[in-house]
Amino acid sequence: TSSASSSSSSAPFLASAASAQPPLPDQCPALCECSEAARTVKCVNRNLTEVPTDLPLYVRNLFLTGNQLAVLPAGAFARRPPLAELAALNLSGSRLDEVRGGAFEHLPSLRQLDLSHNPLAYLSPFAFSGSNASISAPSPLVELILNHIVPPDDKRQNRSFEGMVAAALVAGRALQGLHLLELASNHFLYLPRDVLAQLPSLRYLDLSNNSLVSLTYVSFRNLTHLESLHLEDNALKVLHNGTLAELQGLPHVRVFLDNNPWVCDCHMADMVTWLKQTGVVQGKDRLTCAFPEKMRNRVLLELNSADLDCDPILPPSLQTS
């Protein structure tokens, strides 16, 4: 591994950059560490405020974590010649609050993108599609990691955060080849209708540690390749028949439902019956009731219809706001 800031082998590159020569294809940017053998560049925890312009053409894996990038403009990674090998880009924890349309254009091999732990007050609808055409060129992205990108309340613009993220996921139908999508820890209360229908290749979907209160309008029907669906640590109270049937109809799926505040009243009967016979839910023996009080901590699999009656009103603590 060579480092521009410490290795003598990089001195000529620094000199050539200073004399305004075009960047050499295999130089290492200042404040970064580079390994041509591993095709990897790491510019980590260096308080960078913009993406280095002189990235080596060989870069396949680029780590720009722990910086202070603030804004990713259109063409943030566009170079002449292009970074044609760049396949994995990690921008997590870099204090990004704005990702503009076309930020990832001209990266023809980009398969994995991690924007986690950035407080994104603005995510352009065209961040991943690159254009505002109703059908864009397919994105090469296969894995998109967007955990904990929710901004603090005072930085949210006057818009639904769920809607902003969804718009970027469906724009131009560019992400039809996406296999993995992580959206954990984003305070989502809901998924806008039809978002998943436009991501038909998904194999892994992580919605854990959100505040989802219902899946009634979420259609899983098109996700025939889905293998893992993570819904742990949400605010789900019951899954209704339509959802149960859709999940059961997915040939390969494993669903994770731990740590939701299940309401064990008469409306839970269908879900309990389904749980007892399905192989879809992982760790189903761990699912317990949260409400009503008299049912707290009862195991769902151990309930029968006589246990599931309807009291008129549930306590205010059931609410999610």
Partner: antibody, heavy 118, light 107 residues
Framework: QVQLQQSGPEVVKPGASVKISCKAS????????MNWVKQSRGKSLEWIGD????????NYNQKFKGKATLTVDKSSSTAYMELRSLTSEDSAVYYC???????????WGQGTSVTVSS | NIVMTQTPKFLLVSAGDRVTITCKAS??????VAWYQQKPGQSPKLLIY???NRSIGVPDRFTGSGYGTDFTFTISTVQAEDLAVYFC?????????FGGGTRLEMK
């Protein structure tokens, strides 16, 4: 910012038809269902139906099937509702409303008054 | 169709009062309830969705609670600008239906 601009008031004769428009701006039109709601004078709200602008799929309140037809023009980001065989019972203010959280309507047009009178 | 029965129809209030409106669904609508405010001559405005979640920009004096068939909407401290008609709506099953409305008027 999100805006829904509806067409102006209509005064029509019984038996006639009318087509109301709702032009959307400030968001991606195809990303959200559009709802239509009726409010008769001094009365509550009645949901007529919704349309998915992405594919034109519709879902009607049975009460308004045959009365209302919902369509969209994606190229102009405009939703339309046609009301046919009008009677005095159809006199009302009609709203288009964008869906936000599923089912709930987070932005509304200013309303279009339809008066059926001979 | 699910019927949403909203009470009371009218409420006479003074500034600073606490106001509670209830809505009862004819069958369970889970947590799929929204509340709207309509001021005179204006379009309705979404205040609360999924029972208890405030829409963007809605003051925290507006709250909602309930589950299943019984729902409550509360204004903790009424202000003059809150004079309006308030509607509940179930979005659990089509056709989506509204309550009859509650008119808030100043004493």
């Amino acid at each position: 910012q999100v805006q829904l601009q509806q067409s102006g008031p209509e005064v029509v004769k019984p038996g006639a038809s009318v087509k109301i428009s709702c032009k959307a701006s400030g968001y991606t039109f195809t990303d959200y269902y559009m709802n239509w709601v009726k409010q008769s004078r001094g009365k509550s709200l009645e949901w007529i139906g919704d349309i998915n602008p992405n594919n034109g799929g519709t879902n009607y309140n049975q009460k308004f099937k045959g009365k209302a037809t919902l369509t969209v023009d994606k190229s102009s980001s405009t939703a339309y509702m046609e009301l046919r065989s009008l009677t005095s019972e159809d006199s009302a203010v009609y709203y288009c409303a964008k869906e936000g959280p599923p089912g709930a309507m987070d932005y509304w047009g200013q309303g279009t008054s339809v008066t059926v009178s001979s | 169709n699910i019927v949403m029965t909203q009470t009371p129809k009218f409420l006479l209030v003074s500034a600073g009062d606490r106001v509670t409106i209830t809505c009862k669904a004819s069958q369970s609508v889970s947590n799929h309830v929204a509340w709207y405010q309509q001021k005179p001559g204006q379009s309705p405005k979404l205040l609360i969705y999924y029972v208890s979640n405030r829409s963007i920009g809605v003051p925290d004096r507006f709250t909602g609670s309930g589950y299943g068939t019984d729902f409550t909407f509360t204004i903790s401290t009424v202000q003059a600008e809150d004079l309006a008609v308030y509607f509940c709506q179930q979005v659990y099953s089509s056709p989506f239906t509204f309550g009859g409305g509650t008119r808030l008027e100043m004493k």
